[in-house]
């Protein structure tokens, strides 16, 4: 058992049929002595009476707010919640694993330059009686400081007959240089409770490996006299880093037909602008990537050819 | 074919096309040896992020660009040492940060050069014979060096007595080549910065 | 005490379908969740699938994907094991078995598929 | 096929002491635990050992467990008739959990 906050435990359980559980001994934070009693949860059932109170917990009808009165008034209240083990891995019933970019994703996260300012996001199909709680800081064995924002709904989707819900969190490196070299990951740490269950999931990166630039903007598209090509040009998007020849990108390029099936011509340049040859109904596309780095590409800014 | 993009002309400073070969080799050479060394642990994950430039150079500090100077974080550590003009500084006037910040990453080259070398040759001498650095990489960092053209002591090759132990030298491969991927990306910038400037 | 009793096994055709049941008693079945592991005569173990203890998740070996289906009523405390298109290759005895650092099994049920 | 890899059969006299190997990985048994079971003929898989080298109460101490690395060992000293089996490590990957990866199996032979 161990202290999550004031007057909040977290009981961890080896988690199977018949499991003995864990023998947890709750103190009343009072002076008195005699005529104390302890109940749990809105129950009126006295569990016990004296100072301390000791307790089996097996499964979730053990975990509550257990709270110790004396005359009919409260004196302390312990919230115990459970942290269930199942054969030695600790269970992730609260999120869903987002599968990408491999199995057991549970956070993901991504940075739009090398400021040191990033956001994860999480997925569940818990509507209710839920609560996060997000930690952050680069290594663990000697932390540097990350401030992490307010965790907020972020998304809502309906998915076939659940609802799924996505929770994000900004967060931001105390004192990040965008031209550093990583050495120790960024490590971030979500605490999830619903109703008497407690579940932490990790994420450890390195900030140049979650970089995901936003789209290059101002995408203009200048037909040339007399020719069926046109001069594209766009720029580097608002949020990068700056100066921009030494946090360069490589962009690529494509024209679309009106059909998904046509076939698309796809190029890479350093440059931001090219020469396409652009029919009618057809689109041009930009996407931006560090030229020197191979993280994610950037979502595609987009054009209509006529 | 619908797109076509202009090529640009010969780069006025000559290291960067260099640099940009650094770093496919570095990136190339990191990608085999994952693959052949794939029940080791090689992946970014799994390997301890070490510098072995660490107190020897300083060339992320050295070559900030100037934006980032007024930036405190930036700023943990300067090292001045006497500079010698090398070729890539050919006819602009540079400053002595210029002059500080290539000289730093010919000494980047010349340590991993040496730790490379010096790990190759226990590699060699692996029964398995599962892994060995092919010479683009070596060769690679050598034109640099060479484009760069500072006059400099010789790091001695380091010998090793003992019998090497193969496991321990192959994890040690990946991590040298992890963060020889990193510094090559910083030399990269550096090169494109200082072209543009 | 624990008690785990499979049923529904039998012979049956290739291509045609056939359903396990695990009925579970002694402990809340509800909380935990549930595998069903398959072994061929004269074969090894090989697990074929699970189920999270609220049903939420499913997860299944790659041999029985998309024609085996596991479920669970909590209500009734037994588990299911819906399998179509079956082939000769599922002939084997099912056990299903509780997840958990000290697993229960139960005594398994044979299933034969041939014509 | 099966990911762990056990030896197809040890054998040793009765007293003796026999230890039967399973090897993995380091996204299976170098990240989880290990369990190990006992199938006597006709009979399910009774376990003997979770996490690693525990046993469960009325498993006799003759039986014991060890991980190391990518690979997990159980010994069994003082062999006996009864303990004539077939014997199956078992664990986990960490990127397919909950799925159960089981050994190869091994067929323990007492001689004599």
């Known amino acids: 058992i161990w202290e999550l906050k004031k007057d909040v435990y977290v009981v961890e359980l080896d988690w199977y049929p018949d499991a003995p559980g864990e023998m947890v001994v709750l103190t009343c934070d009072t002076p008195e002595e005699d005529g104390i009693t302890w109940t749990l949860d809105q129950s009126g059932e006295v569990l016990g009476s004296g100072k301390t109170l000791t307790i089996q917990v097996k499964e979730f009808g053990d975990a509550g707010q257990y709270t110790c009165h004396k005359g009919g008034e409260a004196l302390s209240h312990s919230l115990l919640l459970l942290h269930k083990k199942e054969d030695g891995i600790w269970s992730t019933d609260v999120l869903k694993d987002q599968k990408e970019p491999k199995n057991k994703t549970f956070l993901r996260c991504e940075a739009k330059n090398y400021s040191g300012r990033f956001t994860c996001w999480w997925l569940t199909t818990i509507s209710t009686d839920l609560t996060f709680s997000v930690k952050s800081s680069r290594g663990s064995s000697n932390p540097q400081g990350v401030t992490c924002g307010a965790v907020t709904l972020s998304a809502e989707r309906v998915r076939g007959d659940n609802k799924e819900y996505e929770y994000s969190v900004e967060c931001q490196e105390d004192s990040a240089c965008p031209a550093a070299e990583e050495r120790l990951p960024i490590e971030v740490m979500v605490d999830a409770i619903h109703k008497l269950k407690y579940e932490n999931y990790t994420s450890s990166f390195f900030i140049r490996d979650i970089i995901k630039p936003d789209p290059p903007k101002n995408l203009q598209l200048k037909p040339l006299k007399n020719s069926r090509q046109a001069e594209v040009s766009w720029e580097y998007p608002d949020t990068w880093s700056t100066p921009h020849s030494y946090f360069s990108l490589t962009f690529c390029i494509q024209v679309q037909g009106k059909s998904k099936r046509e076939k698309k011509d796809r190029i890479f340049t350093d440059k931001t602008s090219a020469t396409v040859i652009c029919r009618k109904n057809a689109s041009f596309s930009v996407q931006a990537q560090d030229r020197y780095y191979s993280s994610s590409w950037s979502e595609w800014a987009s054009v209509p050819c006529s | 074919r619908n797109l076509s993009v202009a090529t640009p002309g010969p780069e006025m400073f000559p290291c960067l096309h260099h640099s940009q070969n650094l770093l496919k080799a570095a990136s190339n050479t990191l990608q085999k040896a994952r693959q052949i060394l794939e029940f080791y642990p090689c992946t970014s994950e799994e390997i301890d992020h070490e510098d072995i430039t660490k107190d020897k150079t300083s060339t992320v500090e050295a070559c900030l660009p100037l934006e980032l100077i007024k930036n405190e974080s930036c700023l943990n550590s300067r090292e001045t040492s006497v500079i010698t003009k090398g070729s890539c500084l050919a006819s602009r006037k540079t400053s002595f940060m210029m002059a500080l910040c290539l000289r730093s990453i010919y000494e980047d080259l010349q340590i991993y050069q040496v730790e490379f070398k010096t790990m190759n040759a226990k590699l060699l001498m692996d029964p398995k014979r599962q892994i060995f650095l092919d010479q683009n990489i070596l060769g690679v960092i050598d034109e640099l060096m060479q484009a760069l053209n500072f006059n400099s002591e010789t790091v001695p090759q380091k010998s090793s007595l003992e019998e090497p132990d193969f496991y321990k030298t192959k994890i040690r491969l990946c991590i040298l080549l992890h963060a020889f991927r990193i510094r090559a990306v910083t030399i990269d910038r550096v090169m494109s910065y200082l072209n543009a400037s | 005490q624990v008690q785990l009793v499979e049923s529904g096994g039998g012979v049956v055709q290739p291509g045609r379908s056939l359903r396990l049941s695990c009925a579970a008693s002694?402990?809340?079945?509800?909380?935990?969740?549930m595998h069903w592991v398959r072994q061929a005569p004269g074969k090894g173990l090989e697990w074929v699938a699970f189920i999270r203890y609220d049903g939420s998740n499913k997860y299944y070996a790659d041999s029985v994907k998309g024609r085996f289906t596991i479920s669970r009523d909590n209500s009734k405390n037994t588990l299911y094991l819906q399998m179509n298109s079956l082939r000769a290759e599922d002939t084997a005895v099912y056990y299903c078995?509780?997840?958990?650092?000290?697993?229960?099994w139960g005594q398994g049920t044979m299933v034969t598929v041939s014509s | 096929q099966s990911v762990l890899t056990q030896p197809p059969s040890v054998s040793g006299a009765p007293g003796q002491r026999v230890t039967i190997s399973c090897s993995g990985s380091r996204s299976n048994i170098g990240s989880n635990t290990v369990k190990w079971y006992q199938q006597l003929p006709g009979t399910a898989p009774k376990l003997l050992i979770y996490y690693n080298d525990q046993r469960p109460s009325g498993v006799p101490d003759r039986f014991s467990g060890s991980k190391s690395g990518t690979s997990a060992s159980l010994a069994i000293t003082g062999l006996q008739a009864e303990d004539e089996a077939d014997y199956y490590c078992q664990s986990y990957d960490r990127y397919t959990h909950p799925a159960l990866l089981f050994g190869t199996g091994t067929k323990v032979t007492v001689l004599g």
């Open positions: 078995k509780t997840h958990g650092s000290h697993d229960n």
């Open positions: 002694g402990f809340t079945f509800s909380s935990y969740g």
